[in-house]
Amino acid sequence: QSPIFGPQDVSSIEGNSVSITCYYPDTSVNRHTRKYWCRQGANGYCATLISSNGYLSKEYSGRASLINFPENSTFVINIAHLTQEDTGSYKCGLGTTNRGLFFDVSLEVSQVPEFPNDTHVYTKDIGRTVTIECRFKEGNAHSKKSLCKKRGEACEVVIDSTEYVDPSYKDRAILFMKGTSRDIFYVNISHLIPSDAGLYVCQAGEGPSADKNNADLQVLEPEPELLYKDLRSSVTFECDLGREVANDAKYLCRKNKETCDVIINTLGKRDPAFEGRILLTPRDDNGRFSVLITGLRKEDAGHYQCGAHSSGLPQEGWPVQAWQLFVNEESTIPNSRSVVKGVTGGSVAIVCPYNPKESSSLKYWCHWEADENGRCPVLVGTQALVQEGYEGRLALFDQPGSGAYTVILNQLTTQDSGFYWCLTDGDSRWRTTIELQVAEATKKPDLEVTPQNATAVIGETFTISCHYPCKFYSQEKYWCKWSNDGCHILPSHDEGARQSSVSCDQSSQIVSMTLNPVKKEDEGWYWCGVKEGQVYGETTAIYVAVEERTRGSPHINPTDANARAKDAPEEEAMESSVREDENKANLDPRLFADEREIQNAGDQAQENRASGNAGSAGGQSGSSK
């Protein structure tokens, strides 16, 4: 008796697909050894068709896969586009040869069943409507018309032209004639259920002169589409239920016990387990919609079903589509923090991983909103204008080649709490969800800027200082000027760096930036921050207003200002300047071509300002102090 187990008999029809699961004993060796599927020949030899080593025979090319699930001690063989030639004896097994541990599987592929010549075959999915066509001769034009269902030798009336309807077909069956047709009547049966399947006979007239037609109705359960996704990646369920349910509420549910628990529907219901990581998006007016789930967890694996019903809940006899989702724990997507905490007035730096092979892809950050079916308006992107309300406090720092980009949000308020998504216009699996929790601050912020009311006068020298605590001693301090396309680092001078770390004086740790001479275009937001290499830390922001010199205000010679600043010995002045050129950039349409659930992004692309060279000259000059 073999320790491998699977189905001994598998039967299907031509054109269909099968999914064969084979179970093996849970040992380390079994989990990692070769898995195979072979066909038993008359000579006793079993010819490999597909194996976990990557072998795929010519006859299975493009229509078969073998996937190992070590965590379940199973492997699955999927075979599509079946033909009668696939009928035969097979083995699923483990081992370096096809003589190791195996299980015998018999596969039978039949033709679509044939019936007597006058039998019409109707194949419909659960929940759909079938229209059965019944022909009759002129002599029975005024006779009673009926449709009955065969049960053994008996034929039980479903509906007839005297307006009788079998209770189990009530409100589902109608008998009618079209236009002026005198030789044909029709029976519609809607909201089909599996037990509707069977042989029907329609009849016009009575006795030997009656006209009869046979109809075989096959009602198919939805064959689940198999989806294999990595842990922490995302999945999109594309649901196309047809025009007949275009105006009904839509839902996605997950099978559990005898019910199917609704995860999200268009009536506003949403499972708390998917809060912040789900979007339902109508695709068109014909009832198509999609549901996107990000940040996949191990427990998300299971059977999903989408459907439509006015209640927004699963209902017998309404169309459905099904999926089986597998979540692979051996993920290429790195584990990143799912919850980031901040305090009011403070800042957060969120690291967003992306596929390192796509370093040139456009990066975005959006805010998941719970209203209606969930939406995620883009707040910032590599070529997207920062959304209103986020000016001066939100920037995206791309680090090409590192497989990650950083989003910094400062001047935090409790309203910033919520869920945010990192996404790119490339590999859609690399979507990560972060929950930001902002609590009320209980102490002064780590970074403080003086003066706090920063007004610079055109033509004069203006110095702004950022005080930092000793814990940031070893980190790189920087000043940057915020603009719609990021925060461009400026020359600055760190006064604390000269001291030894042993005798760090908390009061004198200062990084300062000087504008000399001040110009009108220097007005705007400036950030002071700390970082270690590519890892960004705390930031604080200040708005510098620029005004004309008022009459009577003392004119300070910039050289005097510099001289006055040179209290500390051995300090040299550094001067550089940064000009910002304005031009227009449009959001890459590829990002949203198939991903319309991330809304409002296109609108924000209209007036984007793309950066010129952050190191080019003009406008600001930083001078050491």
Epitope: F5, P224, Q324
Partner: nanobody, 129 residues
Framework: QVQLVESGGGLVQTGGSLRLSCAAS????????VGWFRQAPGKEREFVAA??????????YAADSVKGRFTISRDNAENTVYLQMNSLKPEDTAVYYC????????????????????WGQGTLVTVSS
Amino acid sequence: QVQLVESGGGLVQTGGSLRLSCAASGRTFSVYRVGWFRQAPGKEREFVAAVIWSGASTYKYAADSVKGRFTISRDNAENTVYLQMNSLKPEDTAVYYCAADPLGLPGPDVRVEGGYRHWGQGTLVTVSS
């Protein structure tokens, strides 16, 4: 809720045959797998056979101890699953239970009781020598 009712049990001699029926009623549209289990006096319940249907495909499973003797089948129109038992042996004596579940394929292992959410009351099969 899905209700399952087994029938067809009884007393039979060694080598004889019986056909057990499992009739489902209620929310049967959500049933995609049906299994037969049995429990002999003083023993644990064990897997006998199962059928899973997925679209137009059907998958049949059987325990090694009944392979070649027991066959599982279904009548979709009647919402009934049958277990045809041939060449019966005294060790087949047990209460036979029918179980059903909405999870089709791949789903949990068909041999595991936890893979089924609905159970019938059982029907007794006695094989005399």
